[in-house]
């Protein structure tokens, strides 16, 4: 079965900077990736970025840069402009639409005890959908 993994990482040098890494493990070709925060896409989550393998990437604040890391993984850099760090307690979700599997989504967050520079373990909370 396909699987989506999510890692959230706080940058060691910039405590207000976070990076979300997501990947798709499975056959088929990825047609679109959506990254949201605060919950799954379409279930209360707010879209941060949309990445298409050929048409390009789009992102909205507080996302700073969305990019493809490999053909099946992406990263999203976030900049926290506030004095406090709301990202620390936020859930980030990545939804991969692939052909012919359908859509697969997983969520993750920064562990409460995380030190800067350490990332959350790839423990996906899969929301399995075949849209």
């Amino acid at each position: 079965t396909p699987e989506v993994w999510v890692q959230v990482q706080m940058e060691a040098t910039e405590l207000s900077s976070f990076t979300v890494h997501c990947g798709f493990l499975g056959p088929g070709s990825i047609s679109l990736v959506t990254v949201s925060w605060g919950g799954p896409d379409g279930a209360g989550g707010t879209k941060l970025a949309v990445l298409h393998p050929e048409l390009g990437t789009r992102q909205w604040a507080p996302a700073r840069q969305a990019r493809w890391e490999t053909q099946s993984s992406i990263s999203l850099a976030l900049e926290d402009s506030g004095a406090s760090s709301p990202f620390a307690n936020t859930t980030f979700c990545c939804k991969f639409a692939s052909f012919p599997e359908g859509s697969w989504e997983s969520c993750g967050s920064l562990p409460p005890s995380s030190d800067p520079g350490l990332s959350a373990p790839p423990t996906p909370v899969p929301i399995l959908r075949a849209d």
Partner: antibody, heavy 114, light 113 residues
Framework: EVQLQQSGPELVKPGASVKISCKAS????????INWVKQSHGKSLEWIGD????????NYNQKFKGKATLTVDKSSSTAYMELRSLTSEDSAIYYC???????WGQGTTLTVSS | DIVMTQSPSSLSVSAGEKVTMSCKSS????????????LAWYQQKPGQPPKLLIY???TRESGVPDRFTGSGSGTDFTLTISSVQAEDLAVYYC?????????FGSGTKLEIK
């Protein structure tokens, strides 16, 4: 079939403001991310900015910051672009287009003249 | 901002001829992660909005005739029309789809003799 229907031509005086609309149909509105593009007479295309319909997140071309403001009304599936402090330089055709520019509105002609 | 430079600015050909137009970007449009080039080509006929022809530098949009071919990588790209038809009379624009702000070339105007 996705369709973007833009508001009609506008003739406005210098210094005034104008609000152009772009109504989307043929899909769930929250699936639409709207780009706005300017085309001055006989000239090339300039990207103004884009807006994400769920939370109204925006990106602007630095050149149009302070000139254009992008908003959405989810209840009517409509995106808006307001242009302020208009001058003759703002006279152009303004287009809305979907996220990856694969569907375009028919264009709204703006003429700024006293 | 990424500057897109197109050449020639205009060209005039007879129906059935092959046409090539160039687009150069001031920065690479290649994403090293997935080896995709984020460049698009548009066709704008008189009195109409632009129409997406090619994306990812070489992928034809659905419904676009196969006489249109996009090629190139990095900073140098080409749009080729293998056998020009009368309905291809238009201005062709390339676009940086790689990074904000999305920028367009100045266009190549294709006229039919």
């Amino acid at each position: 079939e996705v369709q973007l229907q833009q508001s009609g031509p506008e003739l406005v005086k210098p210094g005034a403001s104008v609000k152009i609309s772009c109504k989307a149909s043929g899909n769930t509105f929250t699936d639409y991310y709207i780009n706005w593009v300017k085309q001055s007479h006989g000239k090339s295309l300039e990207w103004i900015g884009d807006i994400e319909p769920n939370n109204g997140g925006t990106n602007y071309n630095q050149k149009f910051k302070g000139k254009a403001t992008l908003t959405v009304d989810k209840s009517s599936s409509t995106a808006y672009m307001e242009l302020r402090s208009l001058t003759s330089e703002d006279s152009a055709i303004y287009y809305c287009a979907t996220l990856y520019f694969d569907y375009w509105g028919q264009g709204t002609t703006l003429t700024v003249s006293s | 901002d990424i500057v897109m430079t197109q050449s020639p600015s205009s060209l005039s050909v007879s129906a059935g001829e092959k046409v090539t137009m160039s687009c150069k970007s001031s920065q690479s449009l290649l994403n090293s992660g997935n080896q995709k080039n984020y460049l698009a080509w548009y066709q704008q006929k008189p009195g109409q909005p632009p129409k997406l022809l090619i994306y990812g530098a070489s992928t034809r949009e659905s419904g676009v005739p196969d006489r249109f071919t996009g090629s190139g990588s990095g900073t140098d790209f080409t749009l080729t029309i293998s056998s020009v038809q009368a309905e291809d009379l238009a201005v062709y624009y390339c676009q940086n789809d790689h990074s904000y702000p999305f920028t367009f070339g100045s266009g190549t105007k294709l006229e039919i003799k």
